[in-house]
Interface confidence: low
């Protein structure tokens, strides 16, 4: 079998809300993946599991099941959203993210994603990690592949 390629494109949008009482930030982060099937037979994308880390702490997880079928030599773009919560021991970030005196409130998040594909009863997992800037101070939509990132793409340990 030929390879199935997973390419993390970046953050498509980040929608932010706050709970001032508990100094908590809620970030709904929508990411975009390109999945390319280089085989001459179709492949099922069984699930996508994703998690987001801030400062080595997992702040959000998501799982999509029974996503799509990718035809032979075809590519599909898939968006997935990870709801994240920055709270508790990281609530000091509330002050940074709500500070009115600065325009861009970028924080560095690590996006981790694992795509599970299946064909002929065989299952394959492909994982990627990417450090990404996200603005926690306002709702932001990004041009695909235009969102700022730190180029530290590496396979999941």
């Amino acid at each position: 079998p030929r390879s199935i390629e997973v390419k993390y494109i970046g953050v498509k949008s980040a929608y932010v809300s706050y709970d001032a009482e508990k100094r908590t930030i809620y970030l709904n982060i929508t990411n975009t993946l390109n999945i390319t099937n280089n085989n001459y037979y179709s492949v099922e994308v069984e699930n996508i599991t994703a998690q987001v880390q801030f400062s080595k702490t997992v702040i959000g997880k998501a799982r999509l099941n029974n996503i799509t079928n990718i035809g032979p030599l075809d590519m599909k773009q898939i968006d997935y959203t990870v709801p994240t919560v920055i709270a508790e021991e990281m609530s000091y970030m509330y002050d940074f993210c709500t500070l009115l005196s600065i325009k861009v409130h970028n924080i560095v998040l690590m996006m981790q994603v694992t795509v599970t594909t299946a064909y002929f009863g065989h299952s394959e997992q492909i994982s990627q990690e990417r450090y990404q800037y996200v603005d926690c101070g306002r709702n932001t939509t990004y041009q695909l592949a235009q969102s700022e990132y730190l180029n530290v793409l590496q396979p999941q340990q």
Epitope: D19, A20, E21, K22, R23, T24, Y26, V85, A87, E88, E89, S91, D95, T98, L100
Partner: antibody
Amino acid sequence: QVQLQQSGPELVKPGASVKISCKASGYRFTSYYIHWVKQRPGQGLEWIGWIYPGNGITNYNEKFKGKATLTADTSSSTAYMQLSSLTSEDSAVYYCASPYYGIRNCYFDVWGTGTTVTVSS
Amino acid sequence: DVLMTQTPLSLPVSLGDHASISCRSGQSIVHSNGNTYLEWYLQKPGQSPKLLIYKVSNRFSGVPDRFSGSGSGTDFTLKISRVEAEDLGIYYCFQGSHVPWTFGGGTKLEIK
């Protein structure tokens, strides 16, 4: 040590306004919420609202919107609550409070001394 | 508003006795961030309230270990294992999960 010192008792006439103060000491005033709590004689406690002195943002219990106005003066590390259009229902002890020690865990672990407001003609 | 109902209103005890105060919320007070902000305060006559327990079961600094909190969802309990004279006063539960934050009506712990 961390303290919230409130202004003295007030005797005011119905329909008038009163402004009571809460002076913070022993910590960085701009970094912690100041809450206000009402206690009528022989009754329980009611949360009025909070102010975050660092940016002046406030949040009120709907019940006290229009009745209470919260402000803060960072230069003197003092929070204020103004009560308007006073009636006998507003006669109470008013406390300021702050979540200094447990900022991420609890609401009121430092309390002011309380200010008694009596509304009487 | 979330109604916090405390029982009993009055709790007569002898020194050294065990005491238990119940607090029931009108709806679940699990905050959207997963925590339950249920607190217990003690107010002695002529004094400001003092924090005893936060997030259901955590004793605040300096609070004796004879005080313990438990519960989940809508039902919460404060227990005092051996009542001492300094424990007398009015106990309030409080929820900080849903605005407006609300207190229970209070339970007066007094000598039998």
